[in-house]
Interface confidence: low
C-alpha cells in the first residue's frame, strides 16, 4: 500500500509503505494554465482519497480567489452510483466539467475567456454519503489569460427602415476593441452606434448607408488593429456585400 503526497506544483515528494488506507487525500493540479482571451482553457485537477470504491453521492466544486472560502464558479452533484455529475452552478454558463469525478478527475473547461478570468482556481470534492469526507486543493491552479489582438468576426449589410440599409460589424479582442466605421460619405467617415459588448466581443452599427460604395469597419486595441469592408451597390434595391 502506498501513501503519496504532492507539493504545490504536483511533484511527488515521497512514497512510503504503510497500513490502510491505500491512499490519503491529495489533489494534483498544475501550477499554471495559460490561454488567450476569447479562447477556452482546461483547468486540470485529479485527486486521490482514502475511501476505496466510494460509490455514494458526491459534489464537485470549483471556486476562485481563495481556497475553501472563495466564491464558487462551478458546482455539480452526482447521485449514488451515477457517473453523471448534474451541473447546479456554472457562472455565466461558461464552466463545464470535463473530468469524471467517479474516476478521480475534476478537470474543468472555461469557455470564452476574458482578462478578468485571470486568477487562482481551486477544485474541491465532497463525499456526502456515509463517508462524509471532503477535500480541496490548497494551492490551486493559476489561470493566466493573455490579451488578444482584435479580430473582426462578422460584417454585414442588412435591410433597414424605409428602404434604407444598415451595416453591422462585430469584433473580438481583449481588451475589447474600439470600433469605427468609415465610408463614402462626405468627410469619409460616418458616426457608428457602439453596441453593447458581450464579454470580449463588441458590435457597432452604422444605422443608415446613404451612398453606394465601400464601408470599412476598423477594430483597434492596445495590441493591434483589424479592418474589414463591405460594398453597397443598390441594383434593383438589393444589397451586395463583399469583404
Amino acid at each position: 500500500l502506498v501513501k503519496t503526497r504532492r507539493d504545490a506544483s504536483g511533484d511527488l515528494l515521497n512514497t512510503e509503505a504503510h497500513s490502510a488506507p491505500a491512499q490519503r487525500w491529495s489533489m494534483q493540479v498544475p501550477a499554471e494554465v495559460n490561454a488567450e482571451a476569447g479562447d477556452a482553457a482546461v483547468l486540470p485537477c485529479t485527486f486521490t482519497h482514502p475511501h476505496r470504491h466510494y460509490d455514494g453521492p458526491l459534489t464537485a466544486i470549483w471556486r476562485s480567489g481563495e481556497p475553501y472560502a472563495g466564491p464558487q464558479v462551478f458546482r455539480c452533484t452526482a447521485a449514488p452510483g451515477s457517473e453523471l455529475c448534474q451541473t447546479a452552478l456554472s457562472l455565466h454558463g461558461r464552466f463545464r466539467l470535463l473530468g469524471n469525478p467517479r474516476r478521480n478527475d475534476l478537470s474543468l473547461r472555461v469557455e470564452r475567456l476574458a482578462l478578468a478570468d485571470s486568477g487562482r482556481y481551486f477544485c474541491r470534492v465532497e463525499f456526502t454519503g456515509d463517508a462524509h469526507d471532503r477535500y480541496e486543493s490548497r494551492h490551486g491552479v493559476r489561470l493566466r489569460v493573455t490579451a488578444a489582438a482584435p479580430r473582426i468576426v462578422n460584417i454585414s449589410v442588412l435591410p433597414g427602415p424605409a428602404h434604407a440599409f444598415r451595416a453591422l460589424c462585430t469584433a473580438e479582442g481583449e481588451p475589447p476593441p474600439a470600433l469605427a466605421w468609415s465610408g463614402p460619405a462626405p468627410g469619409n467617415s460616418s458616426a457608428a452606434l457602439q453596441g453593447q459588448g458581450h464579454g470580449y466581443q463588441v458590435t457597432a452599427e452604422l444605422p443608415a448607408l446613404t451612398r453606394d460604395g465601400r464601408y470599412t469597419c476598423t477594430a483597434a486595441n492596445s495590441l493591434g488593429r483589424a479592418e474589414a469592408s463591405v460594398y453597397l451597390f443598390r441594383f434593383h434595391g438589393a444589397p451586395g456585400t463583399s469583404t
Partner: antibody, heavy 120, light 108 residues
Amino acid sequence: QVQLVQSGGGVVQPGRSLRLSCAASGFTFSSYAMHWVRQAPGKGLEWVAVISYDGSNKYYADSVKGRFTISRDNSKNTLYLQMNSLRAEDTAVYYCAREGGSYYGYFDYWGQGTLVTVSS
Amino acid sequence: QSVLTQPPSVSVAPGKTARITCGGNNIGSKSVHWYQQKPGQAPVLVIYDDSDRPSGIPERFSGSNSGNTATLTISRVEAGDEADYYCQVWDSSSDHRVFGGGTKLTVL
C-alpha cells in the same frame, strides 16, 4: 497585515451570558471561515466553534453545544461568540482564529485572547 | 471522534534535536498541523499539512506523518524554542477540529 482584535471578556456569574467580539482587518474577512478556541488556566487548547465564510454553516464542540452561538457580520468584519448559561468550567482565555488552507484547515492567524472568568 | 495523544513534556539540550510526537488512530491519513505557544501569548502556527512551513518559521522546524504517529522535529534547538507545542487535525466524522493535549518543550 492581518489583525484580529478581541473584546468582551470579563467576570460573569454562573448562568449568566456574555458576548465576545473579534474585529478583523488586513484581509477579506468575508472569504474566510473563522473559529473560536479556548484555553482553561494551565490547560491545553480546546476548539469551541467554527462558522463558514458566509455564515451558512456552524459547528460546535459538544461541551458548548446548545449554549454558545457563533455568528459573524461580514459588513462589519466582525466575529462574535454569544455565551449563555455559563458554567465555571467555561472559565478560559478565548481566542478567535482565522482558518487557512483547505477544508482540513489550520489556524493561521489568532487574536490576542480575552479572559472569561465564570465565578460567583 | 479523533483522540490525539502527546507526551506531556520533552527535554532537550541546546543545539540538539527535539522530537515531539502526536499519536492517533491512523493519523497518517489526516493532515496534521502544529502550533507553538509561549507563556501569555497566542499560539503560532509552525507546521501545517504535516510538513509545510509558514513563512517566517525557521527551517529548523519540520514535520512528518505516517501510520499512527505524526512528529514535529526541531533541529539545532535554541532557548527561544522553549514553549508548549500542540498538534491539531480535522475530524471528518464530526466536522470538529481536535487538538492534542500539548507538550511542554524544555531546553536544558
